[in-house]
Interface confidence: medium
């Protein structure tokens, strides 16, 4: 005969655990239903009645099956210089990200408190290390035989074109200029770009009895340009 399916609430067999989407209520000493994402426990279960769930109120959410007494608050509204990449719904937190070309320079558990512009490497310097979610661009002088003629947070140093006859030799900030005959080898037109970093998205644990990967709001602060470092510009 097939085993009977127990309906919540029910007392688990000694040594066994509750099923998926159920939790063990210490007070009732019963396996009870969890609430679905977007809901919270309005009334906890008893020996004779199951959990009563209710929808999260506006500006609050739960992302996991849970039995929390109240939903989590969505993070702060995004500032004018942020992009809301995920809206606050009953099932997910708001996510604010730095605008393109910026990175998170000061963060806390709630997210990014300071969004700063990525350093731009000036002509004669190229990107040695691209910016990331939490680190600035690192510039380096273009080595002999390479150049960068742009002010950019993404362009690397590119090799000079190789000429049959050189009209003007290249330097760190200018490509070689060939005489009217075409060069033997040249780079494809246009600068070489490195990918832009994705703005910070900090992880924040939802206080439910199981771990959450709910991303918390990134808080961003539009700030003035970084002070010029060697080979960089704040413009």
């Amino acid at each position: 005969l097939p085993a009977q399916v127990a309906f919540t609430p029910y007392a688990p067999e000694p040594g066994s655990t509750c099923r998926l989407r159920e939790y063990y209520d210490q007070t009732a000493q019963m396996c009870c239903s969890k609430c679905s994402p977007g809901q919270h426990a309005k009334v906890f279960c008893t020996k004779t009645s199951d959990t009563v769930c209710d929808s999260c109120e506006d500006s609050t959410y739960t992302q996991l099956w849970n039995w929390v007494p109240e939903c989590l608050s969505c993070g702060s509204r995004c500032s004018s210089d942020q992009v809301e990449t995920q809206a606050c719904t009953r099932e997910q937190n708001r996510i604010c990200t730095c605008r393109p070309g910026w990175y998170c320079a000061l963060s806390k558990q709630e997210g990014c408190r300071l969004c700063a512009p990525l350093r731009k490497c000036r002509p004669g310097f190229g990107v040695a290390r691209p910016g990331t979610e939490t680190s600035d661009v690192v510039c380096k002088p273009c080595a002999p035989g390479t150049f960068s003629n742009t002010t950019s947070s993404t362009d690397i140093c590119r090799p000079h074109q190789i000429c049959n006859v050189v009209a003007i030799p290249g330097n760190a900030s200018m490509d070689a200029v060939c005489t009217s005959t075409s060069p033997t080898r040249s780079m494809a037109p246009g600068a070489v770009h490195l990918p832009q970093p994705v703005s910070t998205r900090s992880q924040h644990t939802q206080p439910t009895p199981e771990p959450s990967t709910a991303p918390s709001t990134s808080f961003l602060l539009p700030m003035g340009p970084s002070p010029p470092a060697e080979g960089s510009t704040g413009d």
């Epitope: 709630e110 924040h204 206080p207």
Partner: antibody
Framework: QVQLVQSGAEVKKPGASVKVSCKAS????????IDWVRQATGQGLEWMGE????????YYNEKFKGRVTMTRNKSISTAYMELSSLRSEDTAVYYC?????????????WGQGTLVTVSS | DIVMTQSPDSLAVSLGERATINCRAS??????????MHWYQQKPGQPPKLLIY???NLESGVPDRFSGSGSGTDFTLTISSLQAEDVAVYYC?????????FGQGTKVEIK
């Protein structure tokens, strides 16, 4: 306008605990940090820690860890600071202050202060 | 912890004269071109009041005779023309990292 109103003065015996409340109004309580700062009579300001009411996350000054607990009640926009194992040197005015998540990153509005006296 | 040291401890200035308070941090309070240094004014029996945030930004409603400058570890609060209502204790504070720390305070009086 932003307002932080704190609970009244307290007199406690050494070893006891005190819980100070701070009711916020005039802004979205869950959006910004509430910091707690104390000032002994005639002394300077000392940061105790802060709470982010949206999530309940707390950041404590190591000096007070184990003795201080910061909580909040979102439904009544109130933050609390409880200090346990009180000693005479904890006699001070305790202030709550709002610190914006981004923008100033400074304490731009303060409560009126709560005097806590620890005396046997 | 970042230690904040103010100088002088007290300052007596004539009405209408300039008052200058210095604050030195034990390590830089800058991050990506921003200084996380703030100045507060506290009058007897009152909570502190924010005057200047992030080194040089005047808080709304604060008279423009107050100004802040500096970066890295050295910062200055200037009162360009001292008024009677400016008699108070002034504190610097850093919020670059926990624990946030204050200077010991500078008492400004009228000469």
């Amino acid at each position: 306008q932003v307002q932080l109103v704190q609970s009244g003065a307290e007199v406690k015996k050494p070893g006891a605990s005190v819980k100070v409340s701070c009711k916020a109004s005039g802004y979205t309580f869950t959006d910004d940090y509430i910091d707690w700062v104390r000032q002994a009579t005639g002394q300077g300001l000392e940061w105790m820690g802060e709470i982010y009411p949206g999530s309940g996350n707390t950041y404590y000054n190591e000096k007070f860890k184990g003795r201080v607990t910061m909580t909040r009640n979102k439904s009544i926009s109130t933050a609390y600071m409880e200090l346990s194992s009180l000693r005479s040197e904890d006699t001070a005015v305790y202030y709550c202050a709002r610190s914006q998540v981004y923008g100033k990153i400074a304490m731009d509005h303060w409560g009126q202060g709560t005097l806590v006296t620890v005396s046997s | 912890d970042i230690v904040m040291t103010q100088s002088p401890d007290s300052l007596a200035v004539s009405l209408g004269e300039r008052a200058t308070i210095n604050c030195r941090a034990s390590e830089s309070v800058d991050n990506s071109g921003n200084s996380f240094m703030h100045w507060y004014q506290q009058k007897p029996g009152q909570p502190p009041k924010l005057l200047i945030y992030r080194a040089s930004n005047l808080e709304s409603g604060v008279p423009d005779r107050f100004s802040g400058s500096g970066s890295g570890t050295d910062f200055t609060l200037t009162i360009s023309s001292l008024q009677a209502e400016d008699v108070a204790v002034y504190y610097c504070q850093q919020s670059k990292e926990d624990p946030y720390t204050f200077g010991q305070g500078t008492k400004v009086e009228i000469k």
